[in-house]
């Protein structure tokens, strides 16, 4: 089941999935001046069996001017190596979801792809947040969001992360004004919501994560 909405937006923060659950779809988008080849795939799809998951379909872009030349998607070894450096390497990172069954790694780039990747997440997907450069993290809990199904509707949990400018004087995290939940009302008022304990991430996580994963052009 696809998640109805996109993950929550946190001011001055970006999010990143460490791996993608089976069923996730990625738009085949091309940069300006290029377009998908005729009869080319609209999406890549994370599929698999109990032991291995991978991306089905290939995205191919061709010049908008010359429609008969196709750009192949097969990544060069250097491209694959470069992309791997965008994963969290910190000892404080959560378990590597990409090594879990039922998850795909970040797909390698294809030639002339757009600068922004557009994913369609499925229930159970987890994304991690980090403050952008020049902002620091204040925490009340995990800097993550999970897409959950409740009463037939999907919702993303609210990440407990506030990003403050490094020059600003701010309250202690415990004194922060509570952020609104995704539906615009406190979670306590939403009686039918299921609360689960996701695995805890040390409060320093967002501050110590390798920034490279959030500064790639694929945000």
């Amino acid at each position: 089941e696809l998640c109805d909405d996109d993950p929550p937006e946190i001011p001055h923060a970006t999010f990143k999935a460490m791996a993608y659950k089976e069923g996730t779809m990625l738009n085949c988008e091309c940069k300006r001046g290029f377009r998908r080849i005729k009869s080319g795939s609209l999406y890549m799809l994370c599929t698999g069996n109990s032991s291995h998951s991978s991306w089905d379909n290939q995205c191919q872009c061709t010049s908008s001017a010359t429609r008969n030349t196709t750009k192949q998607v097969t990544p060069q070894p250097e491209e694959q190596k470069e992309r791997k450096t965008t994963e969290m390497q910190s000892p404080m990172q959560p378990v590597d979801q990409a090594s879990l069954p039922g998850h795909c790694r970040e797909p390698p780039p294809w030639e002339n792809e757009a600068t922004e990747r557009i994913y369609h997440f499925v229930v159970g997907q987890m994304v991690y947040y980090q403050c952008v450069q020049g902002y620091r993290a204040l925490h009340r809990g995990p800097a993550e969001s999970v897409c959950k199904m409740t009463h037939g509707k999907t919702r993303w949990t609210q990440p407990q992360l506030i990003c403050t400018g490094e020059m600003e004087t701010s309250q202690f995290p415990g004194e922060e004004k509570p952020q609104a939940s995704p539906e615009g009302r406190p979670e306590s008022e939403t009686s039918c919501l299921v609360t689960t304990t996701d695995f805890q991430i040390q409060t320093e996580m967002a501050a110590t994560m390798e920034t490279s994963i959030f500064t790639t052009e694929y945000q």
């Epitope: 909405d5 996109d6 937006e9 779809m25 085949c28 988008e29 377009r35 557009i118 369609h120």
Partner: nanobody, 126 residues
Framework: EVQLVESGGGLVQAGGSLRLSCAAS????????MAWFRQAPGKEREFVAA????????RYASSVKGRFTISRDNAGNTGFLQMNSLRPEDTAVYYC???????????????????WGQGTQVTVSS
Amino acid sequence: EVQLVESGGGLVQAGGSLRLSCAASGITFNDHTMAWFRQAPGKEREFVAARDWSDIITRYASSVKGRFTISRDNAGNTGFLQMNSLRPEDTAVYYCAAREGGVVAGVRSGAPYDYWGQGTQVTVSS
């Protein structure tokens, strides 16, 4: 010249229904993703629903899921938004949009649509 023209808006009582139409000219809908957005007074434009030309993905905002249905008649180059169980908070100007790529949804999705209509007003009274 590409044109998207919405129609079907109007004033309706809460709980009522409306069917919006989006007629396209200058492009063929059968190779474009079609979407609906809305903008209430004083608020940002928000995603409502989208459906790609191959019907692989249809997405709805959680606020309208189960009440609104997006559909398309590729032969007639027209898209539709069937709105049932309307609520006062559905009051807004509704815009039709189209793009060549796959479905884009959510709050960050205004820019990737290539073509936009002028909008049609929907007012739901309580």
